[in-house]
Amino acid sequence: MMCLECASAAAGGAEEEEADAERRRRRRGAQRGAGGSGCCGARGAGGAGVSAAGDEVQTLSGSVRRAPTGPPGTPGTPGCAATAKGPGAQQPKPASLGRGRGAAAAILSLGNVLNYLDRYTVAGVLLDIQQHFGVKDRGAGLLQSVFICSFMVAAPIFGYLGDRFNRKVILSCGIFFWSAVTFSSSFIPQQYFWLLVASRGLVGIGEASYSTIAPTIIGDLFTKNTRTLMLSVFYFAIPLGSGLGYITGSSVKQAAGDWHWALRVSPVLGMITGTLILILVPATKRGHADQLGDQLKARTSWLRDMKALIRNRSYVFSSLATSAVSFATGALGMWIPLYLHRAQVVQKTAETCNSPPCGAKDSLIFGAITCFTGFLGVVTGAGATRWCRLKTQRADPLVCAVGMLGSAIFICLIFVAAKSSIVGAYICIFVGETLLFSNWAITADILMYVVIPTRRATAVALQSFTSHLLGDAGSPYLIGFISDLIRQSTKDSPLWEFLSLGYALMLCPFVVVLGGMFFLATALFFVSDRARAEQQVNQLAMPPASVKV
């Protein structure tokens, strides 16, 4: 992909970013008593930037080398590297910084595809797993719950580790871990269902390490519009991986004649990707893209980080909005195929299903729509935000809010259309999901703007935790519970099976509207919280060690 090949060049705002980074370097040069010469902002041949820390030269290949500092009392003051043109300057390698970072982003995105491919391969062969192990629906629910709960619990732990230790090592270990567990789980004997449950829990832990840390590395490789673009690519991996997971699950099962083989594909790819991450992803410093180099040290405790995040209103509101998205996608993903099947039974275009899988065709269509709308949503959201940033500083949360509120309308229309037209319902699903998914990458970008680099992994983890806890961990069960409750008070008929589930699912658009409100609330505080984060970053770049953040 061209956009990955040379990301910094492809992004429309690349020149603007360069100028912005240049201004920041000059400003810091002045702050650090460089005599106002701006030597810290000096650029070497081919445009190698000297980091704000003054002790590193970032080469075009993305590598970092120690820069010579002049002896005390010389013009090359401590904390300000010699200019690239001056004596003693090291000439950077003539390779492309954009290409190195682009490759890193590509590998990280590939890893995210695999994360979701692995997760949804299991979903793709879930009926076979249920059949083989004799798993009841409550057992299948347990598999899902254990995965989400372990993911939720592990996310904050990896957030803490990700802000303090080598991130690419944690990432690779996480991938190697879930790959090994998934591969092993394909050999679990029929009588050890509890081992399968445990393996899903362990996979959840392994995948939490990735989902929590990878976006923060992208955040440290890029800024502004390029970062939005790269996060869009990264988050497009979710619908792509999910769709590929279903496809892999069913096609490998058919090709091999045994569902066990489906669980052996993603681990092999995972091992390769884990190795590529170790080799190709640079060990970036936190705040690297913000030209902060070595200066950002995690001096704060986890408790202080948590307090700061909870006080960050943009972060809190955007996290609650993310939970609303998660609630809706979790519930719709589980129940819409069955709802549409029941709609067809009412319309007399399908038979009542007594032997599952019920609505297998609808699941397939819904899966394909989700995959495509995921892509369309991410692209639309990123494009809209980019355009709106020219008009307002609050573009990010406002685009999300509009997407959410628009999505709620079309989700409501699904239940109106389904009574008479399945095609109409699918069109509403298509538009509704596109709008709902448009905020994926933008939400991640909001987080990058309002949270300082040394807290980003913790912030991503906490957001992941809350969005699962308040979102998809409970929504499928809540919808099922409400549907059963309605059915208990009505007569047993295909019409009421359809209506009760429809009424229960009507909770989703209300939650999505609530999410839109949370994004509007984010818009209120976004500018001030972003400015505060930038101010804190600038403070962190100054010499005094005891900067309170």
Partner: antibody
Framework: EVQLVETGGGLVRPGSSLKLSCATS????????MSWVRQAPGKGLEWVAL??????????NYAESIKGRFTISRDDSKSRVYLQMNTLRDQDTATYYC????????????????WGQGVMVTVSS | DIVLTQSPPTLSVTPGESVSLSCRAS??????IHWYQQRSNESPRLLIK???QSIAGIPSRFSGSGSGTDFILSINRVESEDFSVYYC?????????FGPGTKLEVK
């Protein structure tokens, strides 16, 4: 004590129908998978049909030899499982056993931990 | 469908002897094999589940082993009540299938 008692057997003509019933007691029937297994005179055992519990949508599975002719069903309120046999053939002559699958709440074993005493079905003209 | 083959079809032993009954699957089935005993004019009863797991109330002289395609039911010191037909059953995949049985008779 777990008990499975089959009824409804007898002599019928080819092409006719018969409904076997299995009354159960001593365990939580609504959570348990049930099967019918048959044994032709002097022959081995053959699994016929399986019905899962309501937590598995009461899904039914059948042996290829009887698919489309036999229907397994259950009535949780009466703790009974049934086998409706239509278009009976000579080769359906056998002792039909009602069997229970061992239950583990979240999942179930496919083996049979309890068997009824069996009921004889003879298909002959 | 998975086909199970039991050998020998008939096995003649004297009480007190130890015997091994074999069951072979047409494809690898891990440990998803179960053994049943059917005495004359009685219903079958479960002896061993998942190749080697013992069942409550079944004498300890019955044991099972094997994995993949080859399985063994061992009876240590056969007693008079053990002379019956023994069936293996696979639960690796539907349809559930039984072996043709091995008849254990008095020599």
């Amino acid at each position: 004590e777990v008990q499975l008692v089959e009824t409804g057997g007898g002599l019928v003509r080819p092409g006719s129908s018969l409904k076997l019933s299995c009354a159960t007691s001593g365990f939580t029937f609504s959570d348990t998978w049930m099967s019918w297994v048959r044994q032709a005179p002097g022959k081995g055992l053959e699994w016929v049909a399986l019905i899962k519990d309501k937590n598995s949508n009461s899904e039914a599975n059948y042996a290829e030899s009887i698919k489309g002719r036999f229907t397994i069903s259950r009535d949780d309120s009466k703790s009974r499982v049934y086998l409706q046999m239509n278009t009976l053939r000579d080769q359906d002559t056998a002792t039909y056993y009602c069997t229970r699958h061992e239950d583990f709440y979240y999942y179930s074993g496919y083996y049979f931990d309890y068997w009824g005493q069996g009921v004889m079905v003879t298909v002959s003209s | 469908d998975i086909v199970l083959t039991q050998s020998p079809p008939t096995l003649s032993v004297t009480p007190g002897e130890s015997v091994s009954l074999s069951c072979r699957a047409s494809q690898g089935i891990s440990t998803s094999i179960h053994w049943y005993q059917q005495r004359s004019n009685e219903s079958p009863r479960l002896l061993i589940k998942y190749a080697s797991q013992s069942i409550a109330g079944i004498p300890s002289r019955f044991s099972g082993s094997g994995s993949g395609t080859d399985f063994i039911l061992s009876i240590n010191r056969v007693e008079s009540e053990d002379f019956s037909v023994y069936y293996c059953q696979q639960t690796y995949s539907l349809p559930l299938t039984f072996g043709p049985g091995t008849k254990l008779e008095v020599k």
